[in-house]
Interface confidence: medium
């Protein structure tokens, strides 16, 4: 289970039209459910139940986004429509280039994602928890546009903001 280095990039424009980017670094883990490789894309927050619908019309997203899913306590969803692995597969089928699960409230999902799969996904499936998950969800919940950059080695530059 390798460390996944995740950079969340925010973009801020001003009336003059110039942009500043703000980068927040956090760490997660690559799960065995997916590949250990880098990925980048715009964050799309997905509700776990939103991944249940198998309707083709629900395929709303363009290819190349990073799905962020906050898993709920198992008691709140005792008979899930899909396993956690199934949800990751569904997101990738819909065009996700990577999936990040916040497992803080459902730590059992870690074992589910790390069970040796005969057919692992070809895209990374990362899980985060604790302070890193709080940091991620705080950005995802409050900001309009954010990009996630997932790497399997530490980013070269410090995670401070820089002008573009």
């Amino acid at each position: 289970k390798e460390t996944a280095f995740v950079e969340v990039v925010l973009f801020e424009s001003s009336p003059s039209g110039d942009y500043t980017t703000y980068t927040t670094g956090l760490t997660g883990r690559f799960s065995r459910a997916g590949a250990t490789l880098s990925a980048e894309g715009e964050i799309v927050q997905m509700h776990p139940l939103g991944l249940c619908n198998n309707n083709d019309e629900e395929d709303l997203y363009e290819y190349g986004w990073v799905g962020v899913v906050k898993l709920e306590q198992p008691e709140l969803d005792p008979k899930p429509c899909l396993t956690v692995l199934g949800k990751a597969k569904r997101a990738v089928q819909r065009g996700a280039t990577a999936v990040i699960f916040d497992v803080s409230e459902n730590p059992e999902a870690i074992d589910q994602l790390n069970q040796g799969s005969e057919d692992p996904l070809k895209r990374p499936v990362v899980y985060v928890k604790g302070a890193d998950a709080i940091k991620l969800m705080n950005i995802v919940n409050k900001q309009k546009v954010a990009r996630a950059r997932i790497q399997h080695r530490p980013p070269r530059q410090p995670t401070e903001y820089f002008d573009m």
Partner: antibody, heavy 123, light 112 residues
Framework: QVQLVQSGAEVKKPGASVKVSCKAS????????MHWVRQAPGQGLEWMGW????????RYAQNLQGRVTMTRDTSTSTVYMELSSLRSEDTAVYYC????????????????WGQGTLVTVSS | DIVMTQSPLSLPVTPGEPASISCRSS???????????LDWYLQKPGQSPQLLIY???NRASGVPDRFSGSGSGTDFTLKISRVEAEDVGVYYC?????????FGQGTKLEIK
């Protein structure tokens, strides 16, 4: 010029669902987020959520989570807001409002607004 | 979540006189880029809201220069230098820093 044209007034019974449309014209539809804001009779403005027409990504106000769904049809440049399990307190004028252009993570700015759609929930 | 509070809630004004509306946020709206993420909207009777001021002090396109916005951090003010009959309506401040977006309760400006 930029225009947002909303669907007509609706009368619904408690427990039913309503789907309001907002057709955009005069600009590149996929480049601008769309928000929904509602206003109960004689009350102030309440933000309901947004949809990114490019990715389809959404963000909803916490108090509406699970009851509201925002979708879009890029072929007709139309966004939709569906509210389910309606109750009397959902009686309001529902507005769509276009956000500003660009990749700004925050700095939300609503301009222009649709003409509004009155949804009445009554038994 | 950020909470917005406006005062007064009702503002009777004589045409030609100045008017001032206050808006306070529960946390600072000053972004690290130096801009205050606070907008003002006007909803005229029977109409949809319209953008007046964005980022604290920038007038939206077509807004007369008698309207001005000021303030920083948590305290903001909308001023109308000389009120005209067409300015009647409800004025709302809105924090545009982060979701969930929040409006003030509104200030109803009416002509005396």
């Amino acid at each position: 010029q930029v225009q947002l044209v909303q669907s007509g007034a609706e009368v619904k019974k408690p427990g039913a669902s309503v789907k309001v449309s907002c057709k955009a014209s005069g600009y590149t539809f996929s480049r601008y987020f769309m928000h929904w804001v509602r206003q109960a009779p004689g009350q102030g403005l309440e933000w309901m959520g947004w949809i990114n027409p490019n990715s389809g990504g959404t963000r909803y106000a916490q108090n509406l989570q699970g009851r509201v769904t925002m979708t879009r049809d890029t072929s007709t440049s139309t966004v939709y807001m569906e509210l389910s399990s309606l109750r009397s307190e959902d009686t309001a004028v529902y507005y769509c409002a276009r956000d500003q252009k660009g990749k700004s993570s925050s700095w939300f700015r609503f301009d222009p607004w649709g003409q509004g759609t009155l949804v009445t929930v009554s038994s | 979540d950020i909470v917005m509070t406006q005062s007064p809630l009702s503002l009777p004004v004589t045409p030609g006189e100045p008017a001032s509306i206050s808006c306070r946020s529960s946390q600072s709206l000053l972004h690290s880029n130096g801009y205050n993420y606070l907008d003002w909207y006007l909803q005229k009777p029977g109409q949809s809201p319209q953008l007046l001021i964005y980022l604290g002090s920038n007038r939206a396109s077509g807004v007369p220069d008698r309207f001005s916005g000021s303030g920083s951090g948590t305290d903001f003010t909308l001023k109308i230098s000389r009120v005209e009959a067409e300015d009647v309506g409800v004025y709302y401040c809105m924090q545009s820093l982060e979701a969930p977006l929040a409006f003030g309760q509104g200030t109803k400006l009416e002509i005396k």
